[in-house]
Amino acid sequence: ESALITQQDLAPQQRAAPQQKRSSPSEGLCPPGHHISEDGRDCISCKYGQDYSTHWNDLLFCLRCTRCDSGEVELSPCTTTRNTVCQCEEGTFREEDSPEMCRKCRTGCPRGMVKVGDCTPWSDIECVHKESGTKHSGEVPAVEETVTSSPGTPASPCSLSG
């Protein structure tokens, strides 16, 4: 059973702490790692490894922990105050504009370009034109344009939500 913290158990500075969501401290916020009971009287702890809350809140439910998908590695586990941190496996990356999936990094640059940046969990290899030094747009080139081997295909989707 989740632990209870009554409003009286919280230090005055905690009770009054963040006011941005509240008209007055007496309406009550709960600390990170807790959610508020439906009668507003208690702060109920989140369950370690199952759910969490990161800020002072009036959540009726703690937030569900993210589960790392296959194709991802868990950098840090979910605690009551912090969500799981997942990262794409080596050789794959997650783009800002398609954060739902880890994509395979390209294995080489198109002809006439040189590699200036390695594959990281958050970026594909970076290629620039030999002469001008301008960056390649990032689209995967056609097979015959590639300097080395053929490009990778997108990896399986990587969920960001719990």
Partner: antibody, heavy 117, light 108 residues
Framework: EVQLLESGGGLVQPGGSLRLSCAAS????????MSWVRQAPGKGLEWVSA????????YYADSVKGRFTISRDNSKNTLYLQMNSLRAEDAAVYYC??????????WGQGTLVTVSS | EIVLTQSPGTLSLSPGERATLSCRAS???????LAWYQQKPGQAPRLLIY???SRATGIPDRFSGSGSGTDFTLTISRLEPEDFAVYYC?????????FGQGTKVEIK
């Protein structure tokens, strides 16, 4: 004595809007999370939306997400449900209920929403 | 979402008999977040049991709740004429809040 009194139901065309109200009395309204639950004719109960005591946290059923908005005015002891882009499947008796997770211990008498062209 | 499956769909019994209603969850539900309601035609639902086994205010002791995990039961020890109604279970463990489809207790 706890009382919840819904109003605002009626006949609306598909795509139309309605705003339901629930006037509460007999308890410290601002302390309690509140919910809307609906029941289509001859069907079971379906939870629609919930809101924390202060109004800072809101929750919705997938079937109404993006179309319905729950809110409250604690100075008026009133709960609201703004319903936009109404569909035929939204036709139901809408109940205001005190509570969310552990129990809905008090219910209003319900207000009927009919969606028809 | 947690799906609650109630059985039987309809229970035909006589006054004075014992009624046993089942509510099965698709995943584990903490007893704290399982409730039972009674609804009669044209009326709002009424809370009977919360926390799986605690009777709500004013509910006669012929109504009792039990169970844990995924299996919960509402028992009416001796049916009175006013007990013939539809009964719903409800979970608040995880959003969205869900109800069972209901069990109708009718007069045999």
């Amino acid at each position: 004595e706890v009382q919840l009194l819904e109003s605002g139901g009626g006949l609306v065309q598909p795509g139309g809007s309605l705003r339901l109200s629930c006037a509460a009395s007999g308890f410290t309204f601002s302390s309690y999370a509140m919910s809307w639950v609906r029941q289509a004719p001859g069907k079971g109960l379906e939870w629609v939306s919930a809101i924390s005591g202060s109004g800072g946290s809101t929750y919705y059923a997938d079937s109404v997400k993006g179309r319905f908005t729950i809110s409250r005015d604690n100075s008026k002891n009133t709960l609201y449900l703004q319903m936009n882009s109404l569909r035929a499947e939204d036709a139901a008796v809408y109940y205001c209920a005190k509570g969310v997770r552990k129990k809905f211990d008090y219910w209003g008498q319900g207000t009927l929403v009919t969606v028809s062209s | 979402e947690i799906v609650l499956t109630q059985s039987p769909g309809t229970l035909s019994l006589s006054p004075g008999e014992r009624a046993t209603l089942s509510c099965r969850a698709s995943q584990s539900v903490s007893s704290s977040y399982l409730a039972w309601y009674q609804q009669k035609p044209g009326q709002a639902p009424r809370l009977l049991i919360y926390g799986a086994s605690s009777r709500a205010t004013g509910i006669p002791d012929r109504f009792s709740g039990s169970g844990s995990g995924t299996d919960f039961t509402l028992t009416i020890s001796r049916l009175e004429p006013e007990d013939f109604a539809v009964y719903y279970c409800q979970q608040g463990q995880l959003p969205p809040i869900t109800f069972g489809q209901g069990t109708k207790v009718e007069i045999k």
